[in-house]
């Protein structure tokens, strides 16, 4: 029957690499959107530019990076999309009014150590978590 | 000396509540932006609408939710911002051309169980991670 044929056809389109979401028939090819896909970009943050130079002793700044780009249907595997993002992308593709596209955000962040004066003028060396983008993905 | 006095005066302006990022003088008040702040919104995803009804047996759909809203300066503590997002917000506030605002994305996700036919027509019950948004934040 047409119904079962359609089902079998639908299933055959599902990705073989089904770790992220077995049920997402989201093609593993390049994004159809013209904007650049979600990825990590260069960003050097100068503590002086932030107005923090008077209490941060070191470093002078750091390579923070940032995430930007499209999370459009279909999502590629390198976009580190969560299962929810895969579903949201599909919902947006079917009806853009319903939900926005998922957003390009850090998926892995690293820490940096900062030497600074505290409010009592004591010198503190502290590790600040989640300061440097290591990888971006669609969330 | 004048230099150290100035430094000490500047330091006294840094925030007292410095859990998220000790060095961020990001005010704990409501966003100056007129758009609604980053938060969780309702979204019911019907597997039929996604074209998956022929191989997903159950459930018929699920409450997925989604994240949307502004991540503008200054970030409030309830926005679950990472240290990187706090820095990025400040960089954007100082120079909007440099980087975009951080984006509103899931910070906590839950799993759901799905019963479906695999490619060999076997019935599989599988727990899919990261399917339901539990909380949103600025990333």
């Amino acid at each position: 029957s047409t119904g079962s044929k359609q089902r079998s056809q639908n299933r055959s389109k599902t990705p073989k690499n089904q770790e992220a979401l077995r049920m997402a028939n989201v093609a593993e090819n390049s994004s159809s959107d013209q904007r650049q896909a979600c990825k990590k970009h260069e960003l050097y943050v100068s503590f002086r530019d932030l107005g923090w130079q008077d209490w941060i002793i070191a470093p002078e700044g750091y390579a923070a990076y940032y995430c930007e780009g499209e999370c459009a249907f279909p999502l590629n595997s390198y976009m580190n999309a969560t299962n929810h993002a895969i579903v949201q992308t599909l919902v947006h593709f079917i009806n853009p009014e319903t939900v926005p596209k998922p957003c390009c955000a850090p998926t892995q962040l690293n820490a940096i150590s900062v030497l600074y004066f505290d409010d009592s003028s004591n010198v503190i060396l502290k590790k600040y978590r989640n300061m440097v983008v290591r990888a971006c993905g669609c969330h | 000396s004048t230099g150290s006095k100035q430094r000490s005066q500047n330091r006294s302006k840094t925030p007292k509540n410095q859990e998220a990022l000790r060095m961020a003088n990001v005010a704990e008040n409501s966003s100056s932006d007129q758009r609604q702040a980053c938060k969780k919104h309702e979204l019911y995803v019907s597997f039929r609408d996604l074209g998956w009804q022929d191989w997903i047996i159950a459930p018929e759909g699920y409450a997925a939710y989604y994240c949307e809203g502004e991540c503008a300066f200054p970030l409030n503590s309830y926005m679950n911002a990472t240290n990187h997002a706090i820095v990025q917000t400040l960089v954007h506030f100082i120079n909007p051309e440099t980087v975009p605002k951080p984006c509103c994305a899931p910070t906590q996700l839950n799993a759901i169980s799905v019963l479906y036919f695999d490619d060999s027509s076997n019935v599989i019950l599988k727990k899919y991670r990261n399917m339901v948004v539990r909380a949103c934040g600025c990333h």
Partner: antibody, heavy 121, light 108 residues
């Protein structure tokens, strides 16, 4: 308590289309899978196919080219059409409900009382 | 498709005796997705067991199911006169859903 009742002609001519309807009472047809099963006289049970209330179907491969199952939620009914029948399609035809959740799936309960359809000229 | 073979074809026993019915699958039935039904002459089948071992609502506790993979068993601990009937196993772990050929439990 949910009850199922099959209805339709008891005699169908060879090469014609067998048409049966199952009326569901005591519960909504929504949120369940609804199935047809047949049993030739003195033989075992054969699953024909099912339909979900929203319209998605699955059929038994040997029969799928001849079978159509449809649903009418407004009447709380689902139907079976089996085309190009032969004497081998003579059987008692049962309708039954399949539970549909991640913890409840695949068994038939309850069943209709069945209706005998004879294929003969 | 998964082929279910039931044995014996006929089981002749007396009331009060223990009945052991076997259902063997041609390949493993995932998650023990197996059900048992009882059918009396002129009646529709009635669900006894689902999930290989869970009794359906209203089924007496003398009926029990066991097994996994390819070998399943329905046991009736003490046969009552109303238990003499045909019993079918059915798998729902793979499509198409299939039934065994049945075991007839008759009075000896």
């Amino acid at each position: 308590q949910v009850q199922l009742q099959e209805s339709g002609p008891g005699l169908v001519k060879p090469s014609e289309t067998l048409s049966l309807t199952c009326t569901v009472s005591g519960d909504s047809i929504s949120s369940y899978y609804w199935s047809w099963i047949r049993q030739p006289p003195g033989k075992g049970l054969e699953w024909i196919g099912y339909i979900y209330y929203s319209g998605s179907t699955r059929y038994n491969p040997p029969l799928k080219s001849r079978v159509t199952i449809s649903v009418d939620t407004s009447k709380n009914q689902f139907s079976l059409k089996l085309s190009s029948v032969t004497a081998a399609d003579t059987a008692v035809y049962y309708c039954a409900r399949i539970c549909s959740s991640t913890s409840c799936w695949g068994w038939f309960d309850p069943w209709g009382q069945g209706t005998l359809v004879t294929v003969s000229s | 498709e998964i082929v279910l073979t039931q044995s014996p074809g006929t089981l002749s026993l007396s009331p009060g005796e223990r009945a052991t019915l076997s259902c063997r699958a041609s390949q493993s039935v995932s998650s023990s997705y197996l059900a048992w039904y009882q059918q009396k002459p002129g009646q529709a089948p009635r669900l006894l067991i689902y999930g290989a071992s869970s009794r359906a609502t209203g089924i007496p506790d003398r009926f029990s199911g066991s097994g996994s993979g390819t070998d399943f068993t329905l046991t009736i601990s003490r046969l009552e006169p109303e238990d003499f009937a045909v019993y079918y196993c059915q798998q729902y772990g793979s499509s198409p859903l299939t039934f065994g050929g049945g075991t007839k439990v008759e009075i000896k």
